[in-house]
């Protein structure tokens, strides 16, 4: 999916007031400084690319971050402001539903989740230039 | 089963607000936004905007900006439109809609729809 | 804001007959076109989703086609219930918008 044409200040004001609340409420009692940032990302469509990947697509030692509520947040911000996002999600969510697996919170996806949040600051500072 | 219950019919002055209320139940409220479409005497349909409580956000459209207001009570699953400044050509039917966020992604439930009339 | 053009207005035939209902799109949506059925003095029915996914509790007898700028709503052999509106509505981008509808009428 080409996220180009969405809504960026939407999505922005969207992880605002609501999405980074659930991250930070996900990686509660980890430290800051625990887990190096080693994804990055150089613009919003490339952030918002990187974002999805890093929260739907499961992982090893991390296999679902798709049904925290960080999680349903993004989705629903992706489909309702990023032109036709939500087809593309007809058939994954189908998929979703048949995996849907136990909840466990690994030091795995703290990391994930870690790397999350520094791609959606960047998402939200897209004039800086990258380090 | 899925179920969307509007308020009443409203007869209001030109200039007067109208909040039209629609209550939710049958399905879990906040993984569905609300959305608002009206429908003119005899015309077609129009989209007035959503509001996603999952979000705790609207998006309205254009032609209504600054006369809307969309907002939802979670605790009692009730979506609210609001209308301020109304106009003889605000007279319409107005309904609310859900429409899945996560999944679905289709307005796949509909309110009976209320009348309101514009008239001095 | 994309705009939608339902053909013809209004669509005359007999029970039995086949109704074929157009929907274009004034720029590319893909698959993002939903139909629905509206009676005088009820709220609008969801018929089809995503051009052509079948809704639970419709009658198999509508189907619809279509991506892209063209849709097509088909009603295989139409029932005296039948009788209707039909409005396309995209869900590509905000603000959604629907098309002004296709009045299929007795003959």
């Known amino acids: 999916y080409d996220f180009t044409n969405c809504d960026f200040e939407k999505i922005k004001a969207a992880y605002l007031s609501t999405i980074s609340k659930d991250l930070i409420t996900y990686m509660s009692g980890t430290k800051s400084t625990e887990f190096n940032n080693t994804v990055s990302c150089s613009n919003r469509p490339h952030c918002l690319t990187e974002i999805q990947s890093l929260t739907f697509n499961p992982t090893a030692g991390c296999a679902s971050l798709a049904k925290e509520m960080f999680a349903m947040k993004t989705k629903a911000a992706l489909a309702i402001w990023c032109p036709g996002y939500s087809e593309t999600q007809i058939n994954a969510t189908q998929a979703m539903k048949k995996r849907r697996k136990r909840k466990v919170t690994t030091n795995k996806c703290l990391e994930q989740v870690s790397q999350l949040q520094g791609l959606w600051r960047r998402f939200n500072r897209p004039l800086l230039k990258q380090q | 089963q899925v179920q969307l219950v509007q308020s009443g019919a409203e007869v209001k002055k030109p200039g007067a607000s109208v909040k039209v209320s629609c209550k939710a139940s049958?399905?879990?409220?906040?993984?569905?936004?609300m959305h608002w479409v009206r429908q003119a005497p005899g015309q077609g349909l129009e989209w007035m905007g959503t509001?996603?409580?999952?979000?705790?956000?609207?998006d309205y459209n254009q032609n209504f900006k600054g006369r809307v207001t969309m907002t939802t009570d979670t605790s009692t699953s009730t979506a609210y439109m609001e209308l301020r400044s109304l106009r003889s050509d605000d007279t319409a039917v107005y309904y609310c809609?859900?429409?899945?966020?996560?999944?679905?992604?289709?307005?796949?439930?509909w309110g009976q729809g209320t009348l309101v009339t514009v008239s001095s | 804001e994309i705009v939608l053009t339902q053909s013809p207005g209004t669509l005359s035939l007999s029970p039995g007959e086949r109704a074929t209902l157009s929907c274009r799109a004034s720029?590319?949506?893909?698959?993002?076109v939903h139909w629905y059925q509206q009676k005088p003095g009820q709220a609008p029915r969801l018929l089809i989703k995503?051009?052509?996914q079948s809704i639970s509790g419709i009658p198999d007898r509508f189907s619809g086609s279509g991506s892209g700028t063209d849709f097509t709503l088909t009603i295989s052999r139409l029932e005296p219930e039948d009788f209707a509106v039909y409005y396309c509505?995209?869900?590509?981008?905000?603000?959604?918008?629907f098309g002004q509808g296709t009045k299929v009428e007795i003959k």
């Open positions: 809609a859900r429409m899945g966020v996560t999944h679905s992604y289709v307005m796949d439930a």
């Open positions: 049958g399905y879990i409220f906040t993984d569905y936004a």
């Open positions: 509001f996603i409580p999952l979000l705790d956000t609207s």
């Open positions: 720029q590319p949506i893909s698959i993002s």
């Open positions: 995503f051009a052509s």
């Open positions: 509505q995209q869900t590509f981008s905000l603000p959604y918008t």
